[in-house]
């Protein structure tokens, strides 16, 4: 399947010109997408290009500004906040990333109703995390690990917990490892719907062990930061989970919420909060064996002030081939009776589906079904359940949207998103305006992305939000390489591969070729989105065949193909990559002694694994941020997949699954290994380890570390980086600078 | 030039109640959230209703059970019931758009509503 057929006229060809690594450092063929922030039914604001916030009616069709670029400026703010009364802007500036979704800022409460800084009380800085109530304008935001709530801006703070302290007591935002492996959030609260509650997580760490690693900065003496990461099989952080009236804080002051009975028995994580109504309350919780999940559901009790979870309203899901749920246990959607809720999780057939849960998980309903997943529920109202899948034509890398009829009977399907731009949209997600009244469109891909916005009950578009014209005009005399996905049958198991080719190329003759590999459990490469990047620019000006192979482990295509890595990472993931490298040279324009593989974080894993694997087919390759030994990464991920590193359950596959442990193999290949000294997340020490293991073997390599850089290497590393890793490939593969 | 017009302040007891109106030009009305705003002397102005297009209202915890913020869409007019009127509910009350727009001079003269004990 040709997705970006290149252009036919030969006319144009001495006008066209191929993408340089420039372009790419340079961002310049970046695009836009539009996500709107619905403030009602029928409103939503937008920061314009020249920094104001506007307000947009789509009923109208009017717009007006609400805050001045004067205002943002007059503070530095790179960020707003609408309270729900409309009378109050948070402005967020001295932004200061801290990890993957967390970052320190100063806060500014600015008036619109008076058209001036709320002064008195002023907020404290730098404050880790800052939310208004979803109703009116209180305030809850974390400074120094400790929840604080405000019942109006200009108020004075009521402080709600007093025992946070640095790299051990976090309250309201998680500490690293539930940031990173478990939430995906800088927060650990949550309001309930109205704002009469506010819960939050207590994460203790005392007891964890902290990785120490230097930050060389500009002083005489190194810094070393310390952050407490438990890494597979150590001692965990210990959550509690606690409710507050906020109409009342100081009256009983915090409930800790109990948890299920059989989660409690041994070591365990909490894995999620949703509100169902102002009284009652979801929470998700799950075994440090992550195969067992429990959904409990409770309610306050007015009389004890306490809350409640009733064992009849405890829903237990179990993998007996796997872990629970796919990178993450899927949370609860929960319907207008406030009990009954719709769930993604594995059908009979081992493919995630949407199903309906009104008494027991064992009388679930199953609302979708086939040979393909459902990915996400977006919304649910009183007639319509809005979720993403992958079943349109058969092709587990798209994404459409879909709208099932819950209020009629039997339900009806329809696909909303199908048929809308065929050839340039199959990958898309939305965003619903409340009770679903409007919705945007986001699509990105394969063509370039474009935001729309659409009426709810009818679908009909009623306008493009961003259509990225000036990308379009700038790649018109751009040669783009050529992309198409298509599968692999091997031995019953199926690999969908996406190739990227050169703009001219041709069958007939031989081209080298780089395969990039993440292949983590339940990660997804070949999927059906826009991209000029830098595998773009190596197949268009350099005219390497690029290829990225979804293998065992990864997502979307049912439990067989993911959990089939379980307990055993490190294996199937490079025999995949091996047996496709093997079936395109079968194709025949592939130059055999021209292969190279290269990946970052557990691509950097499964690419030294195949560098190493003895099979001769990779001249060369890179790693990038590598794991090197699942004995290094944090408990919550590792485990997930891979179990305990103990005798009794799985120490054997954690020693046999190391880079380190192939040194030798690496004698015959060119290998380049790149690492950032501050990388919190795969620690320094797994590329040190290689190094050292590849240096007692007296195995050659390359290698190049990026000092203070952390997971990302971000910024001018960037550059630096793909210019490096550019003249390697062209070196490795001969071709001229 | 968009007009605001507000009226049906007065004095009145506590416990008391009154409606106020505000006439607004139509372009600036019609589809547009509105809201109900008062200021009390040396006070900040503040919130009291707000109303969207499609009748969705809002209410701070002061005035909740009391006030009842309402449209007409053809008179382009927006109202305020308030009932059970307290001493503290005292100000000078305006009608804008909810929220307002900047560099938006045509904040009404407003109404006064006094209430005494």
């Known amino acids: 399947i040709v997705l970006r057929p290149s252009r036919v006229h030969n006319s144009e060809e001495n006008t066209m010109r191929a993408l340089t690594l420039k372009d790419i450092l340079n961002g310049t063929f970046s695009y836009k997408t539009f996500f709107p922030n619905w403030i009602s039914g029928q409103e939503y604001l937008h920061q314009s290009a020249d920094n104001n916030i506007v307000l947009y009616n789509i009923e109208t069709g009017q717009s007006y500004t609400i805050l001045s670029n004067r205002t943002m400026k007059s503070v530095n703010a790179s960020n707003y906040g609408l309270s729900p009364d409309r009378q109050f802007v948070y402005l967020e500036s001295d932004y200061s990333k801290l990890w993957r979704y967390s970052y320190t800022a100063t806060y500014y409460i600015y008036d619109l109703s008076n058209g001036e800084f709320v002064r008195g009380n002023e907020l404290p800085r730098p404050i880790q995390y800052l939310c208004w109530s979803p109703v009116g304008s209180k305030l809850a935001y974390v400074y120094q690990n400790n929840i604080y709530l405000k019942q109006r801006p200009g108020d004075p703070p009521f402080q709600i917990t007093f025992n946070g302290r640095e790299n051990k007591i976090f309250n309201g935002i998680p500490d690293w490892v539930y940031e990173e492996e478990m939430l995906a959030t800088k927060y650990a609260l949550w309001w309930s719907p109205n704002g009469k509650f506010l819960a939050y997580a207590e994460f203790n760490d005392t007891d964890i062990p902290v990785i120490a690693y230097s930050y060389y900065g500009d002083e005489q003496y190194p810094r070393t930061i310390n952050i407490p990461y438990p890494k597979a099989g150590a001692k965990n952080p210990v959550v509690r989970i606690f409710i507050i009236d906020t109409t009342y804080p100081a009256y009983v002051g915090p409930q800790e919420v109990p948890v299920p009975a059989m989660i409690a028995s041994s070591d365990y994580y909490f894995s999620w909060l949703t509100w169902v109504t102002d009284e009652r309350v979801c929470l998700q919780w799950l075994k440090r064996v992550q195969n067992v999940s429990v959904l409990s559901i409770c309610d306050f009790r007015e009389d004890w002030q306490t809350w409640d979870c009733p064992k009849t309203q405890e829903h237990i899901e179990e993998s007996r081939t796997g872990w629970a749920g796919g990178f993450f246990v899927s949370t609860p959607v929960f319907s207008y009776d406030a009990i009954s809720y719709y769930k993604i999780f594995s059908d009979k057939d081992g493919y995630k589906h949407i199903h309906y849960i009104k008494d027991t998980v064992e009388n679930a309903i199953q609302i979708t079904s086939g040979k393909w997943e459902a990915i996400n529920i977006f919304r649910v109202t009183q007639d319509s359940l809005f979720y993403s899948s992958n079943e349109f034509e058969e092709y587990p890398g798209r994404r459409n949207i879909y709208r099932i009829s819950i209020g009629s009977y039997p339900p009806s399907k329809k696909c909303v998103t199908c048929h809308l731009r065929k050839e340039r949209c199959q990958y898309y997600t939305a965003s619903f305006s409340d009770y679903a009244k409007y919705y945007a469109l986001v699509c990105y891909g394969p063509g370039i992305p474009i935001s729309t916005l659409h009426d709810g009950r009818t679908d009909q578009e009623i306008k493009i939000l961003e259509e990225n014209k000036e990308l379009e005009n700038a790649l018109k005399n751009i040669q783009l390489p050529k992309e198409e996905i298509k599968k692999l049958e091997v031995d019953e198991i199926t690999l969908w591969y996406k190739m990227i080719l050169p703009p001219q190329f041709d069958r007939s003759k031989k081209y080298p070729l780089l395969i990039q590999v993440y292949g983590g459990p339940c990660s997804q490469s070949v999927r059906s989105v826009f991209a000029v990047n830098w595998i773009s620019y190596l197949a268009s000006k350099e005219g390497m065949v690029i290829a990225l192979v979804d293998g065992r482990g990864t997502a979307f295509q049912g439990d067989k193909l993911l959990y089939a890595v379980y307990r055993k990472l490190g294996v199937y993931e490079v025999e995949d990559q091996i047996t496709a490298v093997r079936k395109f040279i079968e194709m025949g324009f592939i130059d055999e002694k021209r292969i190279a593989i290269w990946g970052w974080s557990y691509g950097g894993y499964v690419s030294s694994l195949a560098l190493a694997s003895g099979t001769g087919l990779f001249k060369c390759g890179i790693a990038v941020a590598p794991v090197s030994s699942w004995e290094y990464y944090a408990s919550v991920y590792t485990e997930r997949f891979m179990g305990l590193p103990t005798k009794d359950d799985n120490l054997e596959h954690y020693k046999n699954s190391t880079v380190m442990a192939r040194a030798e193999y690496f004698r015959n290949v060119d290998y380049l290994l790149i690492h950032g000294t501050a990388d919190d997340n795969v620690h320094f020490q797994n590329s040190a380890q290689i190094a050292k293991a590849l240096v007692n073997a007296q195995v050659d390599f390359q290698a190049m570390w990026y000092s203070d850089q952390n997971h990302g290497l971000s910024g001018l590393s960037t550059n630096h980086l793909y210019t490096h890793m550019t003249h390697f490939l062209k070196q490795c593969f001969s071709l001229s600078d | 030039q968009v007009q605001l017009q507000e009226s049906g302040g007065g004095l009145v007891q506590t416990g008391g109640s009154l409606r106020l109106s505000c006439a607004a030009s139509?372009?600036?009305?019609?589809?547009?959230?509105m809201g109900w705003y008062r200021q009390a002397l040396g006070n900040q102005r503040e919130l009291v209703a707000g109303?969207?297009?499609?009748?969705?209202?809002y209410y701070p915890d002061s005035v909740k059970g009391r006030f009842t913020i309402s449209r007409d869409n053809d008179k382009n007019t927006i109202y305020l019931q308030m009932n059970s009127l307290k001493p503290e509910d005292t100000a000078v009350y305006y009608c804008?758009?909810?929220?307002?727009?900047?560099?938006?001079?045509?904040w009404g003269q407003g109404t006064q509503v006094t209430v005494s004990s």
């Open positions: 804008n758009l909810w929220p307002p727009r900047i560099g938006f001079a045509s």
């Open positions: 139509g372009s600036i009305f019609v589809g547009n959230a």
């Open positions: 109303i969207t297009s499609d009748g969705t209202t």
